[in-house]
């Protein structure tokens, strides 16, 4: 019988504990948020707020500039100086809660916890391939604002998610921020609202259009908004809430909220509930029927998928997917199954199931006792009917209202279950060729890019590497940066390459050569690298 | 009636550059965005960048973000655009046109008379 | 950039026909759309804006219609000084851009 090369498990074909040192920043505290920066010139920033400092950081996360964003009252504060002599409001910390770039000026705005959730902008001045802020501007005018009624509070120190879109010669500030009755109480940030942006960069025009958690609803009933998106013609906002208004408050889910991004009105509001299952292929006895639900997201991010990927969700290359991590419950913690599980929901798709709710509410015959739903906002209603009204009248028409669709979007875990232990805390989706790439930070401080594939038993690894020794967590915001992405763990930025901070993992020449195409990996003598870390022999095309 | 008048034509060698003037009349300069839009003979309309008078903030259109300067004398209530490198091909009339919000919508209400611009060697 | 493309690009027509204009954006714009006619050696004219509503003086034979991608401007009836080249401009995103007109000539 013939001899053969003893064939080398998968596993035992990359070593995940080789040590990989990415470029870094210091931050000097918790980063609180985390944005950047490519100007049409080739200048780009990072910018990195921690409490009471925004950081300006070049592409090298050299610092350029650094900035005092608090406390509050403390004649050190930069930014609070714009607001002219004081004082504004209690003394006291300045978390950042929003910072946010509005691409039409171009300028960076930051809001914090501090001084009624106010906003300030930072017009940015670009010199060489760096970029520089100006001195901010104060987004608060004073006589415009009262406790129950004030256009530039903007932030909530529960939590603040803001996307900017340009609308004529201004630019509408999508807001969506968590309240409670003590926060809904003192100068009320409101659930969700579109702002306009004053041209004379004094705050927001009076008089926006809210939605607003009922004032009997918002001591049980809080929404967590976990992500917040811009793609076609809608402005998307995640949550996390109480799955009934009436029912256990405990009993969380998700919903994605949809925003017109061309009219700044909230008449076509609608929500949808997310559903995403554990489906193992192998079904144990009492499991449910669908499979194991995991109703809680914990990240998102929406990305044009790769032609496999594409396929596989039969859908076009290229088109819009979002895609979440969902966890058993707010602690995320052990269950049955995987700790996180991944799943992807086409933009197309959602936007089609959202219209086919709006026909079932609006086009007659309406289904007897289908309701209109989002009782936290509005009054109780059945379709086709306006909320608290029994009827439609004549100059009314069913579409104008806001509205939750009576079904949900149900998928499965893309990984199937493979994640196992590893708990999912960041999430940034690319297409590199025709791949499609999950880059994962995790609780441990850890990254994973993996592939995202459905039909595979095993998970196609780029790289699955430890960001450094603390193992504090990967924060949710990842911001990328030409080829790199930012990753935040505990007071650091790093600086990942998309394509995989390099080869050393993979530990055979079989294993190395089978590598992506985009990794740029090749057998040197007895290791795995990229051309660049060999100075002899470097071969793609075969092994010794 | 609001009015918006603009400085006479003007003929420049390629290489040069041309500065045309906007006086605003019957409303308050500073409260209202002010555009400038041209057109080549014989062609559509081009818009080439704006310009917010109370803070001087300016937007301009890529295609000439390099030699487009617009400006703003408040006190003369006179917007300003300086196209600088002509070459034959910016040959067109230059209009100012102020844009107002009617309701949530924007649009270009008042439009200046025209200036040509005539780029020859 | 957003491309309006704006058809026919000139039409002859007699006095009292109904003229309809259409004009396609390359992606969504809402209602951000304003309608403008020029007669010549002058400058444009403010016609409709917000795709639907007539701008002040405006006679109320101009209407415009549409939402999204795809508008359209009509004259019911046809008048003489109704003669000129009509405009449609996008105001959603900058840069804004216009289309590349209509010429409404007497047949």
């Known amino acids: 019988e013939d001899w053969q090369c003893p064939r080398t498990p998968y596993a035992a074909s990359r070593d995940f504990d080789v040590k990989y040192v990415v470029p870094s920043f210091s931050a000097g505290g918790l980063v609180q948020a985390m944005v950047t920066y490519e100007g049409d010139r080739n200048e780009s920033a990072v910018f990195v707020a921690i409490r009471n400092r925004l950081h300006v950081l070049g592409p090298d996360l050299k610092s350029v500039q650094s900035l005092a964003t608090g406390p509050a009252g403390d004649p050190g504060c930069q930014t609070c100086a714009a607001c002219g002599p004081g004082p504004h409001g209690p003394p006291g910390d300045t978390d950042t809660k929003v910072l946010v770039l509005d691409p039409a000026l171009p300028a960076l705005v930051s809001c914090g916890s501090s001084l009624q959730g106010r906003c300030f902008l930072h017009d940015l001045e670009p010199q060489g391939t760096a970029v520089h802020l100006a001195a901010p501007a104060c987004l608060f005018s004073a006589h415009h604002n009262r406790p129950d009624d004030c256009p530039d509070c903007v932030a909530s120190p529960l939590g603040t998610r803001v996307t900017v879109v340009e609308q004529g010669q201004a630019s509408y500030f999508y807001v969506a921020s968590s309240l409670d009755a003590a926060v809904a109480a003192s100068f009320s940030p409101r659930s969700v609202s579109i702002r306009r942006l004053k041209a004379d960069a004094s705050g927001f025009a009076p008089g926006f259009v809210a939605l607003s958690v009922l004032p009997k609803h918002l001591v049980s009933y809080s929404i967590e908004y976990v992500h917040s998106f811009h793609t076609g013609a809608f402005v998307y906002f995640l949550t996390v809430q109480p799955a009934s208004v009436t029912d256990d408050p405990s009993a969380l889910h998700t919903r994605l909220a949809r925003l017109s991004a061309t009219e700044p009105e909230l008449g076509d509001y609608r929500e949808l509930v997310l559903d995403c299952r554990f489906a193992p292929k192998r079904r144990r006895r009492g499991a449910p029927e669908g499979g194991q639900p995991y109703p809680v997201l914990r990240v998102a991010h929406s990305a044009p998928v790769g032609a496999q990927l594409a396929t596989e969700l039969s859908i076009a290359e290229g088109q819009e997917v979002l895609f979440g991590v969902f966890v058993t419950g707010k602690d995320g913690g052990p269950g049955v199954g995987p700790n996180s599980v991944v799943c992807a929901f086409p933009i197309d798709l959602l936007d089609t199931l959202i219209d086919e709710g709006v026909e079932r509410c609006c086009e007659s015959p309406v289904h007897p006792g289908l309701r209109r739903g989002l009782d936290f906002f509005q009054s109780p209603s059945f379709c086709p009917n306006p909320p608290g009204l029994e009827a439609l009248s004549p100059n009314t028409s069913c579409r104008h209202f806001p509205l939750l669709v009576s079904s949900s979007f149900s998928r499965v875990d893309l990984f199937n279950g493979l994640l196992g232990p590893v708990q999912v805390t960041a999430l940034y989706v690319t297409r590199l060729d025709n791949v499609t790439v999950a880059h994962m930070g995790t609780m441990d401080g850890r990254i994973l890019q993996v592939e995202l594939v459905r039909s595979l038993n095993y998970l196609l690894y780029v790289s699955n590497f430890s960001l450094g020794d603390s193992g504090q967590p990967v924060q949710r915001d990842v911001s990328r940066l030409g080829d790199h992405l930012l990753f935040a763990s505990g007071d650091q930025v790093f600086q990942v390459p998309i394509q995989g901070p390099g080869c050393r993992h993979f530990l055979t020449c079989g294993r190395c050569l089978r590598a992506w195409h985009f990794m740029g990996c090749g057998w040197c003598g007895n290791m795995c690298g990229q051309q660049k870390e060999c100075p002899g022999s470097w071969q793609q095309d075969h092994c010794p | 009636q609001v009015q918006l008048v603009q400085s006479g034509a003007e003929v420049k060698k390629p290489g040069s550059s041309v500065k045309v003037s906007c006086k605003a009349s019957d409303y308050t300069l500073t409260d209202f965005y002010m555009n400038w839009v041209r057109q080549a003979p014989g062609q559509g309309l081009e818009w080439i960048g704006r310009i917010y008078p109370g803070t001087d903030k300016t937007r301009y259109n890529e295609k000439f973000r390099d030699r487009v300067t617009i400006t703003a004398d408040k006190s003369t209530s006179t917007a300003y655009m300086e196209l600088s490198s002509l070459r034959s091909e910016d040959t067109a009339v230059y209009y100012c046109a102020r844009s107002a919000y009617y309701g949530n919508y924007v649009a270009m209400d008042y439009w200046g008379q025209g200036t040509t611009v005539t780029v020859s060697s | 950039d957003i491309q309006m493309t704006q058809s026919p690009s000139s039409l002859s027509a007699s006095v009292g026909d109904r003229v309809t204009i259409t004009c396609l954006a390359s992606?969504?714009?809402?209602?951000?759309l304003a309608w403008y006619q020029q007669k010549p050696g002058k400058a444009p004219k403010l016609l409709i804006y917000a795709a639907t509503s007539l701008a002040d003086g405006v006679p109320s034979r101009f209407s415009g219609s549409g939402s999204g991608t795809d508008f359209t401007l009509t004259i019911s009836s046809l008048q003489p000084e109704d003669f000129a080249t009509y405009y449609c401009q996008q105001l959603y995103n900058t840069p804004w851009t216009f289309g590349g007109g209509t010429k409404v000539e007497i047949k």
């Open positions: 992606q969504t714009i809402g209602t951000w």
